[in-house]
Interface confidence: medium
């Protein structure tokens, strides 16, 4: 069996998780991708997914999660902004390939969010003064629902699935404050 590995990210409340998941370009470029959380004793739950087919470098925002799929590079970028303590958990990127089960991309990400002063935008010395503009579109997170003995993914609640972002700007100020720790199970 494939040995599952994790990378541990320890962040403060208010900071941003900014990670990438690599995939095989030829096989999965236009496939729909998803960001899932795996809570202890539960099946994976889909929090956000790209469109179907996945659009190249087109940001999809679901609540505080932003996905960008870079087809030419076989890379899915995942950002979780304004992290909260309750966001702590084990996450993974998967590729939807119906009717087969989702294909998991390594590594899983163990996110630990702790309380603590992370600075205000523009004041944290490790902050980055970048403003990421999300296109003024409404993205519906139409994520498939899989039920199988090994994997079950659930679509996010309706309240977070429809995200309207007219002329919106998301100010991600702490994209550089990522602490990376490899964890081998």
């Amino acid at each position: 069996a494939t040995k599952l590995t994790e990378e541990k990210y320890e962040l403060k409340e208010g900071q941003t998780l900014d990670v990438k998941c690599d995939y095989t370009l030829e096989k999965f470029a236009s496939s729909q991708k998803a960001w899932q959380i795996i809570r202890d004793g539960e099946m994976p739950k889909t929090l956000a997914c790209t469109e179907r087919p996945s659009k190249n470098s087109h940001p999809v925002q679901v609540g505080r999660i932003i996905l960008e799929d870079y087809h030419d590079h076989g890379l899915l970028r995942v950002r979780m902004v304004n992290l909260q303590v309750e966001d702590s958990g084990l996450y993974q990127c998967v590729i939807y390939q119906p009717p087969k089960e989702p294909h998991m991309l390594f590594d899983r990400i163990r996110l630990v969010v702790t309380k603590g002063f992370s600075g205000t935008p523009g004041s944290n010395e490790n902050s980055t003064q970048n403003v990421y503009k999300i296109p003024p579109t409404t993205t519906k997170a139409l994520c498939p629902l899989y039920t199988s003995p090994r994997t079950v993914t659930q679509a996010p609640p309706k309240s977070t699935a429809d995200v309207s972002t007219p002329d919106s700007e998301i100010n991600l100020t702490n994209v550089t404050d990522i602490i990376r720790v490899p964890v081998f199970n």
Epitope: L105, T128, P182
Partner: antibody
């Protein structure tokens, strides 16, 4: 493996600006993060900031925030570092360095060890 | 910012000696540490990343160890071409920061 070639030495007056270029060849430009590091005469290394060309987003050390701009031009595989309001203490050798962030499965980060360096560009600030 | 403290700042050694350089981080950085070698008038050269992984083409006499806050670069048998200045650098969080350097001189 990518190779980095920087522009030539510059002599500047205090208060002026300098723009140093760093051209990448032999690799996939967008699969690297490019950092800029400077070294004053007889001193150690100091990270100024960096850019992920694929995303077009730059990160800066607080010390240089507002005075430095790092940009990337994808068609020419060139990264630029512009430093403004120059003072004598900015006299240094400026290096670009790359971090290869594309992995065959994971590696969920963008910058890490600076594995390839440019040859350096000497910038002298003098009146 | 994470402060990186290297020691010693300089050392004198002979060819064939075993040389150890230490680097201490002001807070835990897991294994996200790199080591560089720099010779006069030259750009730094990457030796080790992830605290202990040797860069391609770097002689096996160089080794790195440590995690958390304390790290070590060891040259098992010093060669004439190893006389240089060595820097550690953390890439655990931004800004990236370097140690002050250790100059290895001929005794």
């Amino acid at each position: 493996q990518v190779q980095l070639v920087q522009s030539g030495a510059e002599v500047k007056k205090p208060g002026s600006s300098v723009k140093v270029s760093c051209k990448a060849s032999g690799g996939t430009f967008n699969r690297h993060a490019i950092s800029w590091v400077r070294q004053a005469p007889g001193q150690g290394l100091e990270w100024m900031g960096g850019i992920i060309p694929l995303f077009g987003t730059a990160n800066y050390a607080q010390k240089f925030q507002g005075r430095v701009t790092i940009a990337a031009d994808e068609p020419t595989s060139t990264t630029y570092m512009e430093l403004r309001s120059l003072r004598s203490e900015d006299t240094a050798v400026y290096y670009c360095a790359s971090s290869y962030f594309y992995g065959s499965g994971s590696s969920n980060y963008y910058y890490y060890g600076l594995d390839v360096w440019g040859q350096g560009t000497t910038v002298t600030v003098s009146s | 910012d994470i402060q990186m403290t290297q020691s010693p700042t300089s050392l004198s050694a002979s060819v064939g000696d075993r040389v150890t350089i230490t680097c201490r981080a002001s807070q835990g950085i897991s294994s996200w540490l790199a080591w560089y070698q720099q010779k006069p008038e030259k750009a730094p050269k990457s030796l080790i990343h992830a605290a202990s992984s040797l860069q391609s083409g770097v002689p096996s006499r160089f080794s790195g160890s440590g995690s958390g806050t304390d790290f070590t670069l060891t040259i098992s048998s010093l060669q004439p071409e190893d006389f240089a200045t060595y820097y550690c650098q953390q890439y655990n969080s931004y800004p990236l920061t370097f140690g002050g350097g250790t100059k290895v001189e001929i005794k």
